[in-house]
Interface confidence: low
Amino acid sequence: SQVSQNCHNGSYEISVLMMGNSAFAEPLKNLEDAVNEGLEIVRGRLQNAGLNVTVNATFMYSDGLIHNSGDCRSSTCEGLDLLRKISNAQRMGCVLIGPSCTYSTFQMYLDTELSYPMISAGSFGLSCDYKETLTRLMSPARKLMYFLVNFWKTNDLPFKTYSWSTSYVYKNGTETEDCFWYLNALEASVSYFSHELGFKVVLRQDKEFQDILMDHNRKSNVIIMCGGPEFLYKLKGDRAVAEDIVIILVDLFNDQYFEDNVTAPDYMKNVLVLTLSPGNSLLNSSFSRNLSPTKRDFALAYLNGILLFGHMLKIFLENGENITTPKFAHAFRNLTFEGYDGPVTLDDWGDVDSTMVLLYTSVDTKKYKVLLTYDTHVNKTYPVDMSPTFTWKNSKLPNDITGRGPQ
């Protein structure tokens, strides 16, 4: 049913869904703090622009009785229940900030007539791609997939002279929400990644992964997995690894690699870590002081969601345009706005663009070093370290298939 929006006459409300099931196990209080910090900034920016309006947030909590698993598996209906609650209360804001679980976002998008924008900190799965009124402020699976294909094909760098066309993917079902959807995208037979690779096998058991490390008959030297170094160690331990093996560890929302005193453990020498380039002005902010690096990204996405709304509100008000229109609902894309920690760029489909960083472990210093960066906005790789001190032979990444000569 059509719900009236609290979104006119100088008063603009943001509906924030506070769901029990969330992409990251973050106390809702921290997300509230992030939203409130964002509101303060937005009010200041609007005031500076001479716009004398009120901006508030309404936090909508689910009752937690039915949907209490805490992870995303039971989130499908929770989002719809919250929307029903909003509908019954006739209390919808100009924008919906909320569902982070792919299941709930997909279902809400499907089951509602969305005449308002929806901003998500999460919704990583391919099923949430190309949604006209959905904006995602944490890197979705599609962006990861495009990087991997780009990197696999690259063969003109001093440290990567072979195109790759094969891969193993380790996916055992215990992954965090972000990793689950990243690996799901790589596994999907109809995805861009699968389409571009000649050989891809999913390893689902620890033993399968462990066996591949020294299997002379393996079909690929490259293994993709998702998680942190500790996750890898639990799986790999101190087992011997064939010298041609390259493990790509996807760990996007973790900036521990960049801390000054971090030393890479020995088991990381065959590993390339894919992460996001970290910002640096968050560390002292009131809402992030007690957050782990991953949770900082999650809370930051909520905060940036508020700043994005403020950015769009300012533009529409300055142009004398109505906020409760399809034009506003579809406007949250193809733009750059001033985020909390620097500029944030959204692509044509409302998905955040970022700089991904591929790290390697220097055999000299035992430190993580930047091998290359990748700008998701232009789908381009920028080499950084032209003569890396790799563990691999001749300081070059091996071919993906043992025994295959230069291509």
Epitope: F258, S277, P278, G279, N280, S281, L335, T336, F337, E338, G339, D341, G342, P343, V344, T345, T355, V357, V370, T373, D375, H377, V378, Y382, V384
Partner: nanobody, 131 residues
Framework: QVQLEESGGGSVQSGGSLRLSCAAS????????MGWVRQAPGKEREGVAL???????TYADSVKGRFTISQDNAKNTLYLQMNSLKPEDTAMYYC?????????????????????????WGRGTQVTVSS
């Protein structure tokens, strides 16, 4: 509070030179991205030249080989040396800065953004190149 103040703009004949300066105050970030962004009448803002805290510089294709960005950390001043100026360089030139990221290549990516959204801006200085 961060403040950026540009100077050095003016009118010049095609082929001539100008040197823009940007005095920065209140800027305490150790990792930053700073540079020059211009806006011609009726057009979007575009990055011209950027420099990161690690010294990495990057230029828009249209000014490569003609413009040079530099900084004097002791004076907290940013410069843009503009040589071989063309009429299409006519624009308002803004000094812009942000605590963007720790690595220079991330700063460089700002040059490829439409309307780069830096956190701090100067008021701008007008450059007019006549043929």
């Amino acid at each position: 509070q961060v403040q950026l103040e540009e100077s050095g703009g003016g009118s010049v004949q095609s082929g001539g030179s100008l040197r823009l300066s940007c005095a920065a105050s209140g800027y305490t970030y150790s990792r930053y991205c700073m540079g020059w962004v211009r806006q011609a009448p009726g057009k979007e803002r575009e990055g011209v030249a950027l420099i990161a805290s690690d010294g990495t510089t990057t230029y828009a294709d249209s000014v490569k080989g003609r413009f040079t960005i530099s900084q004097d950390n002791a004076k907290n001043t940013l410069y843009l040396q503009m040589n071989s100026l063309k009429p299409e360089d006519t624009a308002m030139y803004y000094c812009a800065a942000d605590a963007v990221n720790w690595y220079g290549s991330i700063c460089a990516s700002m040059i490829r953004r439409k309307n780069p959204a830096f956190g701090y801006w100067g008021r701008g200085t007008q450059v007019t190149v006549s043929s």
